[in-house]
């Protein structure tokens, strides 16, 4: 019951996290105009990963997409890539985890298969969350660097433009959404991995005993256990107390032709 709850909660938390990552990626407020020097500005600038916007006091908002690809800073491209990778991995993780949920029965899928799918989705969520956190952090670091550079320009006249107040940008709402969403996805992934450990033991213990009872004369054949796993069985020739060490046979994480009979 606790395993099902942990798995279900992990799925829900990850789902919320990935929805947040998607929202953050699409949001325009990655960086917003710093209003410290002019809190009553009539023109407010903010920028996202895909376009920059200007909101006028009149109520009009004008947004312009970054129509160039090569002209954009490498860091911005890197942030975009990290966020997209995070979304893709998260989406795949969600898809896998739906089938791995203990409360959902799909054919005669065994718990060991669900355990492996749960682990796979958990790892995907963790990587997805890390990608989002990394992307947002890289952008935040870029903002901090630019902020202090433009501050120096404002006060030392390095800007080169007389009487021009340089617009400084600070953290936008999307950064906080991204950090929280990435954290949630990470937590959800960890919960899925914890749930995986709870899903495996019963079946694995039984098979381990069964294996030893039949003696060591049984020749090992790939897929001999027919664990119905699409993601590599954790039970192949492995005792439950081996401390998680993996043999060469177990490195495979995607189905081989022997996995289905």
């Amino acid at each position: 019951m606790a395993v099902t709850a942990c798995q279900g909660l992990g799925f829900v938390v990850s789902l919320i996290g990935i929805a947040g990552i998607i929202a953050a990626t699409c949001m325009d407020q990655w960086s917003t105009q710093d209003l410290y020097n002019n809190p009553v500005t009539a023109v407010f600038n903010y920028q996202g990963l895909w376009r920059s916007c200007v909101r006028e006091s009149s109520g009009f908002t004008e947004c312009r997409g970054y129509f160039t690809l090569l002209g954009l800073p490498a860091m911005l491209q890197a942030v975009r890539a990290l966020m997209i990778v995070g979304i893709v991995l998260g989406a795949i993780g969600l898809l896998v985890s739906i089938f791995a949920l203990k409360c959902i029965r799909i054919g005669s899928m065994e718990d060991s298969a669900k355990a492996n799918m749960t682990l796979t989705s958990g790892i995907m969520f963790i990587v997805s969350g890390l990608c989002a956190i990394a992307g947002v952090s890289v952008f935040a670091n870029m903002l901090v660097t630019n902020f202090w550079m433009s501050t120096a320009n404002m006060y030392t006249g390095m800007g080169g433009m007389v009487q021009t107040v340089q617009t400084r940008y600070t953290f936008g709402a999307a950064l906080f959404v991204g950090w929280v969403a990435g954290g949630l996805t990470l937590i959800g992934g960890v919960m899925m991995c914890i749930a995986c450990r709870g899903l495996a033991p019963e079946e694995t213990n039984y098979k381990a005993v069964s294996y030893h009872a039949s003696g060591h004369s049984v020749a090992y054949k790939p897929g001999g256990f027919k664990a119905s796993t699409g993601f590599g069985s954790n039970t192949k020739n492995k005792k439950i107390y081996d401390g998680g060490a993996r043999t060469e046979d177990e490195v495979q994480s995607y189905p081989s032709k022997h996995d289905y009979v």
Epitope: Q33, N38, V40, T41, A42, V43, N45, Q47, S52, C53, V54, E56, S57, S58, G59, F60, E62, R64, M161, Q163, T164, V165, Q166, T167
Partner: antibody, heavy 118, light 113 residues
Framework: EVQLLESGGGLVQPGGSLRLSCAAS????????MSWVRQAPGKGLEWVST????????YYPDSVKGRFTISRDNSKNTLYLQMNSLRAEDTAVYYC???????????WGQGTLVTVSS | DIVMTQSPDSLAVSLGERATISCKSS????????????LTWYQQKPGQPPKLLIY???TRESGVPDRFTGSGSGTDFTLTISSLQAEDVAVYYC?????????FGGGTKLEIK
């Protein structure tokens, strides 16, 4: 055609109060920021106040801050300017204006005269 | 506050001639976010409310004749009337629309010579 009609002007003694109204028609009033601008007799234009479309933000110059209050009733399509502690230098024609692109005051009312005198 | 300075205070130009009005701001009105200058020009005829002519320093309001042209960037702006007509006699104001408080220039009175 956008129409703005000011009312509520008149003669008031120094230290007195007055409330100006601006009735708007022929546009979606609630979508636009609105302003009050005044013009003293024979003088230039002076911005008095601006209110955002959602009533959340109001702006004033130092000359009227704390004395004047801008407000709006989107259900009545009406803009207001509550003027307290009036001074002789507040004597002017008061115009209401609709803000458009570029924060430009694209439409103006005909104005209402406020005279502060003892 | 941004101070707007207009020159000249008054200008007399012959019909059909070019009229040029200058406006200087104490700070740049150029917004880096969209590379637009938040300067507005108004025309006010005697006994009438002001009328919007140009916004974003150079964008003509719909219905405004194309003889009116706005130019300039940063702190220096110009309103040009390419061929003065009798109906152009008015006072012209420039306005900072970039930051609060919104400020107007002192006005330029345009007359026919």
């Amino acid at each position: 055609e956008v129409q703005l009609l000011e009312s509520g002007g008149g003669l008031v003694q120094p230290g007195g109060s007055l409330r100006l109204s601006c009735a708007a028609s022929e546009f979606t009033f609630s979508n636009y920021a609105m302003s009050w601008v005044r013009q003293a007799p024979g003088k230039g234009l002076e911005w008095v106040s601006t209110i955002s479309s959602g009533r959340s933000s109001t702006y004033y110059p130092d000359s009227v801050k704390g004395r004047f209050t801008i407000s709006r009733d989107n259900s009545k399509n009406t803009l207001y300017l509550q003027m307290n502690s009036l001074r002789a230098e507040d004597t002017a024609v008061y115009y209401c204006a609709k803000l458009g692109r570029g924060n430009a005051m694209e439409y103006w009312g005909q104005g209402t005269l406020v005279t502060v005198s003892s | 506050d941004i101070v707007m300075t207009q020159s000249p205070d008054s200008l007399a130009v012959s019909l059909g001639e070019r009229a040029t009005i200058s406006c200087k701001s104490s700070q740049s009105l150029l917004n880096s976010g969209n590379q637009k200058n938040y300067l507005t020009w108004y025309q006010q005829k005697p006994g009438q409310p002001p009328k919007l002519l140009i916004y974003w320093a150079s964008t003509r309001e719909s219905g405004v004749p194309d003889r009116f042209t706005g130019s300039g960037s940063g702190t220096d702006f110009t309103l040009t009337i390419s061929s003065l007509q009798a109906e152009d006699v008015a006072v012209y104001y420039c306005q900072n629309a970039y930051s609060y408080p919104f400020t107007f220039g002192g006005g330029t009175k345009l007359e026919i010579k």
